[in-house]
Structure formats: C-alpha cells, structure tokens
C-alpha cells in the first residue's frame, strides 16, 4: 500500500512538482488535520501559502477567535486560513511574510516580512515581524514590536476601546494602530473616510479602504 | 507646552475665499492628525474635515466637500484650512485641533484659540 | 451621520450640586464618545474620552459612562470654574458629530 503524501505548505507542494495555482490539501507533519489552502505559484518563483484574502466583500471577516483559530471563508476566494494552522507552521521553520495590496485607482504594493511567525494560542497568538522591505511603506503598518491577536469576543489589544469590535475583524491591533486588513470591505466610491475599512496606513492612510489584500507565505529559503 | 496658534479674524464678502492657519508647536506635528471645527455665532460645534501631515492625506465632511482644502506645511508646523465660495452662514469661529492618534480620528486633545471668519456684504 | 442628542440644553445647579448630562446616538457608536467643555469665547478643552477615561489633569469630579447609545458625563460637586456649556462627541464613525450642548448656568 502506497505511502499517503502530504504537504505542510504550498512550497513542498510546488517541490513535488504541482507548480499549477489553486487550491490544496494541507496537513502539519504528526497530525491528521488538514487545511485547504491556496496555492499561489507563479508569483515570485510560486510556492506561496495565502493565509489570507480579501477581493469583494463576499465574506463576512467579523469572526469570533474560535472562527480566527480554524479559518473560515473559500480559500479560493475570501478567506483567513486559521490561526492554528499559521501559528504552528510558521513555528516548524521560518517563514516570509509577503502582503500583497490593491487600491481602487489601480495601484498595487507590497510588504515584505524576512521573518514571520505567530506565537501560540496560550500567547494570543502574537504576531513576530522582522526586516521589512517592499512599496507599501517604509514603515511596518503591523505595529513593531508585535501584538496579540483580538477578535470580537477576545479583547486583547493596547486600546480602552475594544478595536475589534470598534474597526470590525481579527487582527493585531495596537491601540487601534496603522492597519487592518481584516476591516469591513467597502466598495468602491465608498471606499474613503471610513474608520472601520481595510487599513494599510503607511500606503493609504487612514481613511482609506482597499481594494484587495493577499496575505502570504513561504519558508525563508525557497 | 503643546500648543496650536491661529491666525487673525478676517472679513469676508460672499463668494470670496478665506485661508486660516494653525501653526503647531510643542509636539511632533506629523505624529497626529489635525482637525478643522467650526462655531457659529451661539450654536454648537461642527466637524469639518482632518489632514494627515505626515502623508497629507484628508478626509472632509461631505457637506463641505469641493468648498474646503486643508493643507500642511511641515517646514513650519503649520495646518492651513481654505474655504471657498464663502456664504453668510459661514460665518463662525474656525478651529483647528490636534487629534490623539496619528492613525485614526479620535477625540481631540489640543484646540487653537479659534478664528472669527465674518461674511458680510 | 450619527445624531447625538444632548439633554438638557440648559440647566440651573448650585455650587456643591450634582449635575448630569446626557447624550443619546442614533445609532451604536460602542464607546467612541468624549465629553468637552467651552467657556464663552474660548475654544473647547477635552474632559473625557473613550466614554469614561478622564484626560489628564482633569478634576475627578467629573465622570463620564456609558457605551452603544446612551451616555452621561455626571459632574459630582458643581464649582464655580465648571459653568460653562459641555458638548459630547462621537467618534464612531465619519463625519464625527457633536451634541447641541448643555448650558450650566448658576441658580
């Protein structure tokens, strides 16, 4: 009886030969658990795991932590692979981080993380950046040194205010801080003034909502 | 001390245009947002619009869009605010004050002593 | 935009009198809300933000609660500096609002 081959990430999945975009079965190595994620590869060199996407507003990003935790949405289309999954993987080796953003008048931009990973579960599962590069800003819209993780019902941010709640999504938040690009997705004309959109304040500021996000990794020596 | 000084009443006949500056000090003037609000004569108080100096992004109240523009120069820690097309009912105290966040438009902590703009014919 | 109705519009206390304020939005604006007040012919000088943190060096005889529609800024004992006219705010969402104000006045 054949071996059953699994992949922890899109970057195994590319090595094995399946270099086409889409969508993919996942599974941490001593575990049964599997995640679909997609794969996208082709951009710079392939083997990228989206952990994260926003497009049009189809899905709801106003989720509780246990929501966070497992993911939720269409991983080929809006969605938030799940904490857990990220938090251990990102845990195994170390990973890029590259966040890939769209305005409404046609601009793209990115940032560009050389180190990633979330801490535990028990730690809120607190976000650890270092050396960023990228056009998105010269300053990291993930505020430095990281936070915890709040959802609508797990408050764990710097703020009085509960951000989560406030600004709508799970995200890092500071007090509320530069960026959240889990906000509320407002269309287009409607996009701008908005306190609780799609934030990436050294790009856009912080009245504006974006157009896409895509929220990616890839072990450090692809 | 922190500290937000406004220019000097100014009269104005109707469609004319009017500048007010705000000039900062104490602070780090591209560390907050700065913020317009105006009074007029014994009423209460209204949000016109912010500016961002460190990006020079702004946000206007809709009721004042295509009238207002707010500026900044941070060689000089100043916000200017011009409004345009000035109505009689636009006669009121103009002021600017210093939001506590750079990243959101939340409450506001330092104001200006304010500017009379009269708009008379 | 979010209405904030503020009520009353005037009110007439003593010195060492309990006064409260109160302010009442449209719609949920969590606790995005602070409190100011103005003197005549000066500008506005925060007392209150996030519904209930006190700014600093503001006397603990002001308070503020309240969260989703309905708040209170309550000023336990009147002094003769505190008459003036007090404005809520909500910073919820754009455009932020302001109350009508609330005259404190001497009896």
């Known amino acids: 009886k054949g071996e059953q081959i699994s992949f922890r990430d899109c970057a195994e999945v590319f090595k094995s030969g399946h270099t086409t975009n889409g969508v993919y079965t996942l599974t941490l190595p001593n575990s049964t658990e599997e995640v679909k994620a997609y794969c996208d590869m082709e951009a710079g060199g392939g083997g990228w795991t989206i952990i994260q996407r926003r497009e049009d507003g189809s899905v709801d990003f106003q989720r509780t932590w246990k929501e966070y935790k497992v993911g939720f949405g269409n991983p080929s289309g809006e969605y938030w692979l799940g904490n857990e999954f990220v938090s251990q993987l990102t845990n195994q080796q170390r990973y890029v981080l590259k966040i890939h953003l769209k305005d409404w008048e046609g601009n793209e931009a990115y940032s560009l993380y050389e180190h990633f990973y979330l801490s535990s579960e028990e730690l809120n599962y607190r976000i650890h950046l270092k050396g960023l590069t990228g056009t998105a800003g010269k300053i990291s819209s993930i505020s430095q040194p990281g936070n915890d993780f709040s959802t609508k019902d797990a408050d764990n941010d710097k703020c009085i205010c509960k951000c989560s709640q406030m600004l709508t999504g799970g995200w890092w938040f500071d007090a509320c801080g530069p960026s959240n690009l889990n906000g509320m997705y407002y269309p287009q004309r409607q996009n701008t003034n908005k306190f609780n959109g799609i934030k990436w304040y050294y790009w856009k500021g912080s009245g504006y909502s974006l157009k896409g996000t895509t929220m990616m990794i890839r072990p450090a020596g692809f | 001390q922190v500290q937000l000084v406004q220019s000097g009443a100014e009269v104005k006949k109707p469609g004319a245009s009017v500048k007010v500056s705000c000039k900062a000090s104490g602070y780090s003037f591209t560390d907050y947002n700065m913020v317009w609000v105006r009074q007029a004569p014994g009423q209460g108080l209204e949000w016109m619009g912010y500016i961002d100096p460190y990006n020079g992004g702004t946000g206007y109240n809709q009721k004042f869009e295509g009238r207002v523009t707010m500026t900044t120069d941070t060689s000089t820690s100043t916000a200017y605010m011009e409004l345009r097309s000035l109505r009689s009912d636009d006669t009121a105290v103009y002021y600017c004050?210093?939001?506590?966040?750079?990243?959101?438009?939340?409450?506001?902590?330092?104001w200006g002593q304010g500017t009379l703009v009269t708009v008379s014919s | 935009d979010i209405q904030m109705t503020q009520s009353p519009s005037s009110v007439s206390a003593s010195v060492g009198d309990r006064v409260t304020i109160t302010c009442k939005a449209s719609q949920d604006v969590y606790i995005a809300v602070a409190w100011y007040q103005q003197k005549p012919g000066k500008a506005p000088k925060l007392l209150i933000y996030?519904?209930?943190t006190r700014d600093t060096g503001v006397p603990s005889r002001f308070s503020g609660s309240g969260s989703g529609t309905d708040f209170t800024l309550t000023i336990s004992s009147l002094q003769p500096e505190d008459f003036a006219t007090y404005y809520c705010h909500q910073y919820s969402s754009y455009p932020p609002t302001f109350g009508g104000g609330t005259k404190v006045e001497i009896k």
């Open positions: 004050a210093r939001t506590r966040d750079r990243y959101d438009v939340w409450y506001f902590d330092v």
């Open positions: 996030w519904a209930s």
